[in-house]
């Protein structure tokens, strides 16, 4: 079943290469287990950047070598992606799955365009 997911259209990463955005989903029921995946769509590729499964009210547990961290509050997930560089600029899509209890729901956001600007190197001081 389909579910609406909202996320900001544009986010500018910090000078330290950190970008944060909120992914909000309109839960049709009372899900207890939720899976959130961040997809990057750019360069004619789709990459699952990070994924987390969490029980409502608990911390997000990210899978694998995650460059993401996050917290949840109700139907909102606050996501942070770290270590970004200019080449990582692209469309970052939030995908939310309500895993339990049935029925299964899937929602995919329209994406957040994350812009990353590499900091200028400090000029040499004499």
């Amino acid at each position: 079943k389909a579910m609406h997911v909202a996320q900001p259209a544009v986010v500018l990463a910090s000078s330290r290469g950190i970008a944060s955005f909120v992914c909000e989903y309109a839960s049709p029921g009372k899900a207890t287990e939720v899976r959130v995946t961040v997809l990057r769509q750019a360069d004619s590729q789709v990459t699952e950047v990070c994924a987390a499964t969490y029980m409502m009210g608990n911390e997000l547990t990210f899978l694998d070598d995650s460059i993401c961290t996050g917290t949840s509050s109700g139907n909102q997930v606050n996501l942070t992606i770290q270590g970004l560089r200019a080449m990582d600029t692209g469309l970052y899509i939030c995908k939310v799955e309500l895993m339990y209890p049935p029925p299964y729901y899937l929602g995919i956001g329209n994406g957040t365009q994350i812009y990353v600007i590499d900091p200028e190197p400090c000029p040499d001081s004499d």
Epitope: D43, T47, E48, A51, D64, D65, I67, G90
Partner: nanobody
């Protein structure tokens, strides 16, 4: 580095399926992100798909998304590429590659330092 040997290529008709295998030996396989690339005659080598060290995260070229799926079995030191709904434009030599790095946003550009010898996939119309 790890040593990689591919198998599973062959001749298949349009719409058919193949499963490529990549056997690794040497260093700890689970320390490597695995990628799949292909090179068609007269063309540059291009990224096809990749899979993270534990197998939980994947990446795909737009041209194969929904048709190709990478997977891995760390206990067996094996990586796989399941290819469905094959098209003539999928004809190429397919290579598996290993990168000793964690996952990130651009796995197509990871420093793959180990490559297999390649396996030919031919899709006839």
């Amino acid at each position: 580095e790890v040593q990689l040997v591919e198998s599973g290529g062959g001749l298949v008709q349009t719409g058919g399926s193949l499963r490529l295998s990549c056997a690794a030996s040497g260093r700890t396989f689970s320390n490597y992100t695995m990628g799949w690339f292909r090179q068609a005659p007269g063309k540059d080598r291009e990224f096809v798909a990749a899979i993270s060290r534990s197998g939980s995260l994947k990446a795909y070229a737009d041209s194969v998304k929904g048709r190709f799926t990478p997977s891995r079995d760390n206990a067996k030191k094996m990586a796989y590429l399941q290819m469905n709904s094959l098209k003539p434009e999928d004809t190429a030599v397919y290579y598996c590659a290993a990168a000793p790095v964690p996952w990130g946003t651009r796995p197509s550009l990871f420093p793959y330092d180990s490559w297999g010898q390649g396996t030919q996939v031919t899709v006839s119309s």
